[in-house]
Structures are given as C-alpha cells and as structure tokens.
C-alpha cells in the first residue's frame, strides 16, 4: 500500500482545504524535474530560473554563464544547443508545433568566441530539424524535406538530398506514421560517433492514402489539412536508409544501406539506427507483419565506398506468441568490443530481460532473470551496466535503477535506488554523463519528485538538483487523497490497481466510483508516481473513489499478460475492467448505483466498449478522442496487435471489435463523447461514426467537439473539457454543484 503521508491532525483540520478544479487547471501543484544537459564526463548545462545558460563543473564546483538571458531574449529563443567544440550555440525561436514530436523553428547561430551572431550564409526558415555533429561544429539540418550540411556555421550549405517534397518525400525527418508509431522522434538522421558519416532515412509517401480534414481557423473558407496517413491494411511508406561521408560529401554521394533479404521479400519497416563506431552501424528492420525483426550490423568498406551488411551479422528476433518486442522492438546497447551488445527481449519464460549477444541470438547469455522485467538499459561502461526494472518487492509499477558489474565474474548486481528514499521514491529514471562518471536520478514518486546528482563510481549522492520545496510547502494545507496500490487475483490473472480515496475515506460508507482507463497494449497505468491532477481533485473535493486497473495487454508483467490481447483488441481489456469493478463492489464501500468509467484515446475505446458491454454496471461514462474501429487507425500501430483487415487474416475481428457494432447497448447508460475536429492521430471520423451509429439506433447521448483541436485538446480547450466532464460526472453521481 502506498499511502501519501497524512498531514491531517484535528487541530489543523480547519486550515486544510480540498483541491479545487481551478488548482488543477492552473497547474498550481505541478512539479519540476532536473535533467542535466551533459556536455562531458563532469560538466553539464542548465537553464537557470532567469534564463541564463549556465555551465556547471561537478569536479571543480564552479559554474559560469555561457550564454546570457539578454542574448536569448534578443532572438526570443526558447531553446538552445551548444556545439561539441563549444565555439557556437544555436538558438531556437518561432517554435511552431506540427505533430507529437515534430515542429519547425527559426535558428540563429551565436559565436561564443566573439560574442556575435554568425552573419553570412544564415540558415533558411523555418527549419524542420537541426543538429550539431557529435564532434566539432558541423551542422546538419532539414529544410523543405531536404537535408543540408554545413562544415562550419558560417559556410555555405552543401545540399545532400534534392527529391524532398511536401507530403511526398521526406528526407531526414519521418512522415506522420513513422514519427508517431515507429521512431517516436522528430528526426530521421543520425551522426556517426565522431561525425565522419551522416545516416538518414528517406520516406516515400507517394502512394499513401491521404486523410483530409477541415481546419476552420478565422477565414471565410476553412483550410483542408492533408496528411499521408496509412490506416490498417493501406499502402505504407517506402523507406530507404542512406549514409553520406560528411568530410567528402560530393565524392560518392549518399550510399544506400542494403535491406536484409529476408526482410526485403515483403512489406517492411525500418525501426531504428544505432551507430557503433564511425565505420560500423546497426540497423533494425521489421516485417509488416510485426513478429519478425532483424538487426543488421553493417561495416563501411572503404574499398567499395559503401556499406556491407553480411548475413553473418544479421540477428533475427521472432515472437511466436505475439508481436516482436514490447511497444517497440528494443534497441541494442553495444559493448566496447564494438560487435557484441546488450538487448532486452523475452526469455524462455516470457519475461523481458537483458541478454548479451556475442555471435548469435541463439547463443545469447541471459544477464537478468526472474518473474519481473528489465525495462531500460541506460548505459554500458567497461565495467558496469546500468538498467531499470520493476523487480524490487514485486511491484510492477515501480522503477528502480540497478548496476551490474560486468567487469568481474560472476557479475554482481546492486540496486542503486531501492533504499535511497524508500517511502518517497519508488519510480526512477536516470541520466548519465560521458563514461557514466556521474549521473542524475529523477524520482517521480510516489512522494513529491526529487532530482539528485550522484558519483558514477561510488553511487554516492553529491547534491540535490531539485526537491520541489515550494510544491511541498504549497501542499501543506491541502487535503490530498490517499492512494493505494494493490492487486486482485482473478482466474490466474493478476490485476494490479491503484485506488485514489477521498481524504476522510471511511470504509463503512459508500462512495461513487470512477474508473480511469487507458488499457492499450504495452501500457501501464498503475505506477508509483506523484500526481495532483483532475482525478486527485475528484477524490479530494467531490468525494469520489477513482480506480485505475492494469488488465490483460498491459506491460512489464510478462508476455502472458501482454500478448493475451494479440489479434483480439477490445475483448480482454474490457473484461478485466469489468472484473475489477465487480471486485471493488465486493469491498463494500462502493455505491454500485454510481459507477462511471472514462478514458482518452485507447482509453476512450475501452470505456465505450465497457459502457456498451450490457453488464449494467456503469451508470455513465466519457470517451475522449476514442478509436471506434481499428480500420480507422494507423497501420503501424494497429497491425502490430491486430494483423491485417483482410478476409484471410483478421477482418472478422476488425468488424466485431468496433464501438458502432454495439450502438444498441448504449441505451441504458449516459454517454459523453468528446473529440477535437483537427485530431491528426485518432481522426474525428472515429467519433463521427459512433455518433452516426447512435443516431441510427435512436440512442440518446451527449457530445462535445473542440474545433481545430488535435488529440491533446490543449490550451483553453483543456479547461473547458475538464469543467464539462466534471459537470457531467457530478450530474451522473447526483453531486451538488
């Protein structure tokens, strides 16, 4: 059980207040984290509160401003990047968001040696992506879907690609589906470790069907937004990987890296690129039917002036029970011999663990094992491997950082974080300096987040980087809800849940219950993290019990649970939410006439199906930006879990798992359907089809659209959304306003 430290004493009770919706919408109780921007083994940059860019040297204890807030303000810079030779800084301004990760911006180069902006051969605007080489001060950037290279910031650019075209050919940046569902980055170019080579992806979207939607704006006529977006079963982007020698870019030009024959024989994806050395690169490929992944190690052949990917350096990863990997196929972390690597994949018992691959995957040496999962490999040094897992005390929703000594035999394991601030901190991530000389730990909860700096050799804490003192003080007079994380054992399935209870919770009383669900494959909602958010307010002020349940299909508890939903989305996720609700009712403090469910995105899909399950459990529910049919969602994501919507594959379940097919079942629930009209991700089409099916079935429901808003419903829409949902729930639960 994780109970927030209670500060409620009778004498203080009159000074304590509940959370308000305004607190949440204003972000009154938001927290800060501190991630050092490492620039060496012992130095990092950080943007101070007054916007100066400050360089800190851990070993000397000195710090100095390398860039003043005055310089930042002179171009309205919101971000910066120091060149590795420390001669230049790029300043980023005019940020303009595109999709989840992508944005365009204007870039200015500031010369630190003379304190002036670089004049002559200025960068064009707006730029889609820009980055320094890892050594020196070469620049690579993407402008109008083409890649350019500068040997020095003041030099004229060398144009690497010429075929870039909006919505057709993307060089060095991903198209929509690769950005959202495969790379999870705004870039698709990678410098080799010393900047000799630049690798990049070219995405050809020429034959991809286009999603078109209206953007209303303020003009007389709405604009139409067109995005090449492959839905399930549609034509996919064609990807090619090229590498260019940046020292002599015109010599042989970009050289294409060959695709492994077993991958190239049918539709495929490129999933990631990892440089090993300046002359060795590792590419990962994935069949369109995403249960086969190939890791290919390629070497530069100076005699060929191109890249050789011998079959002997191809490593196949295949899943027989589901899809390859977790959400994504894991990426390798290479060791110092530049050929062997560490990688997380399923062991024979179906748990994701670290393996060491020296020659073949079949001969892999398992490094971690147990009925828990290794989650991320942070760093491999010559004598240590740092990783995170949820092993400690068998709580899947925790993250601790471990060190394995790989320099000694047998390797010894040490938990770096387990006992540091045990009550406050059970969910960590880490950020390492070069050679792991130092590292920062960022604790996300369950207590108030704290960021600390540590010695990479001894693990000793050096200093607190951010402890959120102001937040701690601000919360002193707030009646926060209590939180507990527990598990239910049902039919050989373990259902972990988080329950958020009103501050004066009394087990002998009855409370309305709100289920918050996401439930997507390889997700996790039950985590030991701190949050003061909308559901905290609902518990604190409105006296609701809120529960989050990780059912089948969720992550970090083994493949049996994860892959249970393979090829049948929308079945077990819903069943498990319903099962959990029945168990909560049995606990005796839930008013079974006042149970609601809500979710966003995949959670909107699950909440809709739960409401339409015909169980009579739910009085009402909300779906925000839900998927309504898997035929409407992106190919890369959908097909990973569902296969293809073809007769000889899985069309039947595509048809059976729609929300529309269950329209009749909404008759006995109050349903609030919400969607942004400019949702590039889960298209408004999804909600439009739900609404049409409900109208055709003559079922009453409530709806709200947000004009020109995307999948995030940000800005003023957020305030409107949560206010609207609050009213809906209070009405449903007969709570006075």
């Amino acid at each position: 059980i994780v109970l927030r430290p209670s500060r409620v004493h009778n004498s203080e009770e009159n000074t304590m207040r509940a959370l308000t919706l305004k607190d949440i919408l204003n972000g009154t109780f938001s927290y800060k984290t501190f991630f050092p921007n490492w620039i060496s083994g012992q130095e990092y940059l950080h943007q101070s509160a007054d916007n100066n860019i400050v360089l800190y040297n851990i070993e000397t204890g000195q710090s100095y401003t390398i860039l003043s807030n005055r310089t930042m303000k002179s171009v309205n810079a919101s971000n910066y990047g120091l060149s590795p030779d420390r001669q230049f800084v790029y300043l980023e301004s005019d940020y303009s968001k595109l999709w989840r990760y992508s944005y365009t911006a204007t870039y200015y180069i500031y010369d630190l040696s003379n304190g002036e902006f670089v004049r002559g051969n200025e960068l064009p605007r707006p730029i889609q992506y820009l980055c320094w080489s890892p050594v020196g001060s070469k620049l690579a950037y993407v402008y109008q879907n083409n890649i350019y290279l500068k040997q020095r910031p003041g030099d004229p650019p060398f144009q690497i690609t010429f075929n870039g075209r909006e919505n057709k050919i993307f060089n060095g940046i991903p198209d929509w589906v690769y950005e959202e569902e495969m790379l999870a980055t705004k870039y698709a170019l990678w410098w080799s470790p010393n900047g000799k080579f630049l690798a990049y992806a070219e995405f050809n979207d020429t034959d991809i069907p286009v999603i078109a939607y209206s953007y209303y704006g303020d003009e007389q006529y709405p604009r139409t937004i067109n995005i090449p977006y492959p839905k399930a079963g549609a034509k996919n982007p064609v990807v090619r990987i090229f590498i260019i020698d940046t020292t002599y870019p015109a010599y042989v030009g970009p050289q294409e890296v060959p695709v492994p024959a077993m991958i190239a024989s049918s539709d495929y994806y490129f999933s990631w690129l990892t440089w090993v050395t300046d002359e060795r690169v590792c590419l990962q490929w994935l069949k369109r039917v995403q249960n086969v992944s190939v890791l290919s190690i390629c070497d530069f052949r100076e005699d060929w002036q191109t890249w050789d990917c011998p079959k002997t350096q191809e490593h196949i990863e295949e899943s027989r029970t589901g899809w390859a990997g977790g959400f994504f196929v894991s990426t390798p972390v290479f060791s110092y011999d530049a050929i062997s690597y560490y990688k997380i994949f399923s062991d024979k018992d179906g748990y994701k663990h670290i393996h060491y691959i020296k020659d073949t995957v079949e001969n892999a040496i398992q490094i971690t094992s147990g009925k828990w999962e290794a989650i991320n490999i942070f760093r491999v040094t010559q004598d240590s491997l740092f990783y995170s897992s949820n092993e400690f005390e068998e709580y899947p929703g925790r993250r601790n950082i471990y060190r394995i000594s790989i320099g000694s035999y047998p390797p010894s394991k040490k938990c770096v974080t387990c006992h540091l601030r045990k009550e406050r901190c059970q969910y960590y991530t880490a950020s390492f300096s070069d050679y792991a000389k130092y590292y920062a730990l960022v604790c996300y909860g369950p207590g108030i987040p704290i960021s600390t700096l540590h010695d990479g050799r001894t693990d000793q804490e050096i200093k607190i980087l951010e402890e959120n003192k102001e937040l701690e003080n601000a919360l002193k007079n707030i009646q926060l809800p209590k939180e507990e994380i527990k598990k239910l054992e049902v039919d050989e399935i373990t259902l972990w849940y988080k329950m958020i209870l009103p501050p004066q919770f009394d087990r002998s009383k009855k409370y309305p219950l709100l289920i918050q669900v996401y439930g997507g494959p390889c997700s996790q909602s039950v985590r030991s993290v701190f949050a003061v958010n909308w559901i905290s307010y609902l518990a604190s002020k409105e006296g609701m019990v809120i529960a989050l349940v990780d059912g089948r299909g969720t992550a970090f508890q083994g493949d049996k649970l994860l892959y249970a939903v393979y090829r049948k989305l929308g079945v077990y996720e819903v069943e498990d939410q319903i099962t959990a609700v029945r168990k909560f009712i049995e606990m005796g403090f839930i008013d079974e006439k006042r149970i609601a469910i809500w979710g966003w995105s995949y959670g909107g899909y699950v909440s809709s199906l739960a409401l339409a399950s015909g169980t009579g459990l739910f009085k009402c529910g909300i779906a925000v930006a839900p998927v309504s049919s898997w035929e409407y969602y992106a190919s890369v994501y959908t097909e990973r879990f569902m296969g293809l919507p073809t007769k000889d594959d899985n069309l039947e379940h595509y048809k059976n798992s729609t929300v529309m097919a269950r329209a009749e079942y909404f008759r006995n629930v109050d349903y609030l359907l919400i969607h942004g009209t400019a949702d590039d991700n889960v298209h408004f089409q999804n909600s439009a089809q739900i609404a049409k099916a409900l109208v055709n079935a003559q079922v009453d429901f409530q709806a709200m659209w947000y004009s020109d808003q995307n999948h995030g419903l940000s800005g003023l829409s957020t305030n409107h959304l949560y206010t609207h949902m609050t009213h809906f729930l209070k009405q449903c639960f007969s709570l006075s306003d």
């Epitope: 100076e302 005699d303 060929w304 990917c309």
Partner: antibody, heavy 120, light 111 residues
C-alpha cells in the same frame, strides 16, 4: 592520362627488407586507394593489401601482417610497400594498382611491376 | 578466405570463335545490390588489365566483344569473337571479403 610508375628491380638476401615505390600521375592521388599485388614466377596473382592516401586507412592481407608496411607521400603522389624478413618464396613481381572509382574492389590501372628476387 | 576456381585451366580456340570462361566462388560474392567479381587479362611480361568490373560492367576502352555475367557463386567471361590479341591468361578476382583473392587463371591459347 593515369600512370603508375614503379621503381626498378631489386635483388635481396633472405632476412633483408625491400621497399618498392609507385609514383602516380594523371589523377588526384588522395582520392583512390592503391593496392599492392604480387605474382611469383609462373604463378597467379596474390593480393597483399591496400592503402588510402587521402584517409591514411590501410588493409593488409592477414598472411603478410607484421611483415608488410604500406605508406604514401601525398606531396610526391608516391606509394611505398616495404616487405621485411624476406624469404625465397617472396620472389615475385610486385605490382601497385589503382582502385577503380566505380569498381568497388576492381583495379583499373596497374604499374609496370617490380621484380624482387630473394636469393642467398 | 573465398577460393575462386577457374575452368578450364587451358582453353584452345581459333580466332573468330566464341570463348566462355568460368569462375566459381566457394561462397557468394554478391549482395542484393552488387556482385564483387572482376575479370583481368594478362599477357606475358605485362601487368594485368581490367576488363570487367562488378560481374558485368565493361571497363572503358575495352572492346564490346568482352562481356561478363553471373551472380552469387557462378560467373562467366565471354569473348564473342576471338581476335588474335585476345590470346592471354584471364583472371577473375573477388572483392566481397578480405583478403581479396584471384582465381588461378585460364590460359586462352590459339588452337
């Protein structure tokens, strides 16, 4: 036109060293790899290794590793091949050859050859 | 290392005839994009001369009666109509893997 001109014939005793030169002209010397290939009397061709004058990269045949050294002097556009601890079976015609621009390992121009005789 | 076996060892033909020389590699010397096999001609007392690179590409200045074909492990050099100056020793060479290796040669002699 491209030309590779090699140094003259050498007679060496077993255990000695030999250094053969190869002067390039008619192209940018730093752009192309120079290979060294030898041919024993009445026998086939044997690849010894290559050097890239521009990058300084070198690749030797495993068999000769430790006995052979390839160098270049970009100021004179000359490549050198030194073979140490000579044995009688090192008697051969030694060729330098330019790596073809498009050949990916093909050798498009060859020197006239240097006969090295190892005899006691 | 990759062993290249040329056949026949000696080929006796008359001018005007068609010559077919074979080279077999102990393992594939091709990738999906390129075959790393090249052919040379060598006359007595002379350095070898490049004829064909990449299995089938004719080197500039080489008469088009010479052609190359094949991929993977089996390659062929064809001389469509033999001229008197074509009688020489022919070598195949692979650059797929280190060390580069040459075949033992096919001697093309006048019948």
């Amino acid at each position: 036109q491209v030309q590779l001109v090699q140094s003259g014939a050498e007679v060496k005793k077993p255990g000695a060293s030999v250094k053969v030169s190869c002067k390039a002209s008619g192209y940018t010397f730093t752009e192309n790899i120079i290979h060294w290939v030898r041919q024993a009397p009445g026998q086939g061709l044997e690849w010894m290794g290559w050097i890239h004058p521009g990058s300084g990269s070198i690749k030797y045949a495993q068999k000769l590793q430790g006995r052979v050294t390839m160098t270049t002097d970009t100021s004179t556009s000359t490549a050198y091949m030194e073979l140490r601890s000579l044995r009688s079976d090192d008697t051969a015609v030694y060729y330098c050859a330019r790596h073809g621009g498009t050949g990916r390992g093909a050798m498009d121009y060859w020197g006239q050859g240097t006969l090295v005789t190892v005899s006691s | 290392e990759i062993v290249l076996t040329q056949s026949p060892g000696t080929l006796s033909l008359s001018p005007g005839e068609r010559a077919t020389l074979s080279c077999r590699a102990s393992q594939s010397v091709s990738t999906s994009a390129y075959s790393y096999m090249h052919w040379y001609q060598q006359k007595p007392g002379q350095a070898p001369r490049l004829l064909i690179y990449g299995a089938s590409n004719l080197e500039s200045g080489i008469p088009d009666r010479f052609s190359g074909s094949g991929s993977g492990t089996d390659f062929t050099l064809t001389i469509s109509r033999l001229e008197p100056e074509d009688f020489a020793v022919y070598y195949c060479q692979q650059s797929r893997e280190y060390p580069y290796t040459f075949g033992q040669g096919t001697k093309l002699e006048i019948k």
